[in-house]
Interface confidence: low
């Protein structure tokens, strides 16, 4: 009982974590402008992974996509990248999971096979979670850096010019709800793992075979011979995201008519 | 609101140059993409020239090509027109206007007399 | 260049009666991000003009909603249900498609 409440709990919070990521990878508000120092503003810009947009403070807004993949920076590339991935492997774990519920028979399948796909699955959620944190980490870094570099601007100037009202960017929601959504799938994936171990059939028990051997009678008995669930092998570690060294040409600089392509 | 504050009225002779600008409140021009336009009297509205966001650049039309100079001063949030070799069919009410990054006359100055005569 | 053709080039009307005004472009105003950048301005006598309707049939704000726009393609109306005093002036439409950006001859409306 307490493994298929596990079983299900974990399949019910991995589906909310990757519908969340799914929401996230769609939402425009990846990063906001900063109203820190300009609360009172005529406009409001905020940008997602596909599409940037400003906000009139009549409420008049307006939504641009992103043209080319060529001419966007790597790393937001490489955020697209990540979230898709956490995607695409959230959605495969959610179909094999739906076929390793306890709770619904398919066929004479056996307790191993749903074991074997519960893992399979909770794999899944867990690298899918991964995905979601690495994607939205590294966006979140990417503001950090160019928050930082446009403040120091704002003081030291461009080429001699002094820029008064430089638009910096924040935090948008979508962050947030990236960040929830993939822990919410890895934990959904973990308690899917736990569960497996519950689903496989501890014991395996044989019937009474008589081997004649030349001149010797040796009866083996039924034992208490484990099940060996051959999970051990299946533990890889693949590496997701290399969040190496960028030179500063590649840190995504948004504040600027110049960045639409 | 955004607001664009243009120079005022202008006079000038057959040959000479004129600079008109246009100073934006309320928001930053660098995140803006600025056009000019100019309407003769009694005539309708023709596009000079602007920043195309996507190609990252200013884009003249053919008939102002190498007589018109579009710039921008970021550190007052000022745009200029620069219009030379003035002819009197040159005289007409020039105009800025921006789009919020996007393709549409969202904002427009109140309008530069420029009169062209001898 | 896109060519934008508008009739008619005047529209007496009588007031709170509805005016239609036409536009026609040279070719598709279909951008290829899907959009159809087509705007309607209108410049009141001694103004500049001023946004009233952008991508065919968006009303931008402060608008009244006696205002609206249609069409697809290359062909696009600018409706006013009741025509209001204020409603005098010289109606263009634009094209922000492609660059050069164009614009009508503009359509006069006046109140007979």
């Known amino acids: 009982m307490a493994v298929t409440a596990c079983q299900g709990l974990g399949f019910v919070v991995s589906l909310i974590g990757i519908a969340g990521i799914i929401a996230a990878t769609c939402m425009d508000q990846w990063s906001t402008q900063d109203l820190y120092n300009n609360p009172v503003t005529a406009v409001f810009n905020y940008q997602g992974l596909w599409r940037s947009c400003v906000r009139e403070s009549s409420g008049f807004t307006e939504c641009r996509g992103y043209f080319t993949l060529l001419g966007l920076p790597a790393m937001l590339q490489a955020v697209r990248a990540l979230m898709i991935v956490g995607i695409v492997l959230g959605a495969i774990g959610l179909l094999v999971s739906i076929f390793a519920l306890k709770c619904i028979r398919i066929g004479s399948m056996e307790d191993s096979a749903k074991a074997n796909m519960t893992l399979t699955s909770g794999i899944m959620f867990i690298v899918s979670g991964l995905c979601a944190i690495a994607g939205v980490s590294v966006f979140a870094n990417m503001l950090v850096t160019n928050f930082w570099m446009s403040t120091a601007n704002m003081y030291t100037g461009m080429g001699g010019m002094v820029q008064t009202v430089q638009t910096r960017y924040t935090f948008g929601a979508a962050l947030f709800v990236g960040w929830v959504a993939g822990g919410l799938t890895l934990i959904g994936g973990v308690m899917m793992c736990i569960a497996c171990r519950g689903l496989a059939p501890e014991e395996t028990n044989y019937k009474a075979v008589s081997y004649h051997a030349s001149g010797h009678s040796v009866a083996y008995k039924p034992g208490g011979f484990k099940a060996s669930t051959g999970f051990g092998s299946n533990t890889k570690n693949k590496k997701i995201y290399d969040g190496g060294a960028r030179t500063e040409d590649e840190v995504q600089s948004y504040p600027s008519k110049h960045d639409y392509v | 609101q955004v607001q664009l504050v243009q120079s005022g009225a202008e006079v000038k002779k057959p040959g000479a140059s004129v600079k008109v600008s246009c100073r934006v409140s309320?928001?930053?021009?660098?995140?803006?993409?600025m056009y000019w336009v100019r309407q003769a009297p009694g005539k309708g509205l023709e596009w000079m020239g602007g920043?195309?966001?996507?190609?990252?650049?200013?884009i003249y039309a053919q008939k102002f090509q190498g007589r018109v100079t579009m710039t921008e001063d970021t550190s007052t949030g000022t745009a200029y027109m620069e219009l030379s070799s003035l002819r009197s069919e040159d005289t007409a009410i020039y105009y800025c206007?921006?789009?919020?990054?996007?393709?549409?006359?969202?904002?427009w100055g109140q309008g530069t007399p420029v009169t062209v005569s001898s | 260049d896109i060519v934008m053709t508008q009739t008619p080039l005047s529209s007496p009307v009588t007031l709170g009666q509805p005016a239609s005004i036409s536009c026609r472009s040279s070719?598709?105003?279909?951008?290829?991000?899907?959009?159809?950048?087509l705007s309607w301005l209108q410049q009141r006598p001694g103004q500049p003009p001023r946004l009233l309707i952008y991508?065919?049939?968006k009303r931008f704000s402060g608008v009244p909603d006696r205002f609206s726009g249609s069409g697809a393609g290359t062909d696009f109306t600018l409706k006013i249900s009741r025509v209001e005093a204020e409603d005098v002036g010289v109606y263009y439409c634009?094209?922000?498609?492609?660059?050069?950006?164009?614009f009508g001859q503009g359509t006069k409306v006046e109140i007979k």
């Open positions: 309320g928001y930053t021009l660098s995140a803006l993409s």
């Open positions: 070719q598709s105003l279909v951008h290829s991000d899907g959009n159809t950048y």
């Open positions: 634009t094209q922000g498609t492609q660059f050069p950006r164009t």
């Open positions: 991508k065919v049939s």
């Open positions: 920043f195309d966001p996507e190609d990252g650049k200013t």
């Open positions: 206007a921006t789009t919020l990054r996007y393709f549409d006359w969202n904002y």
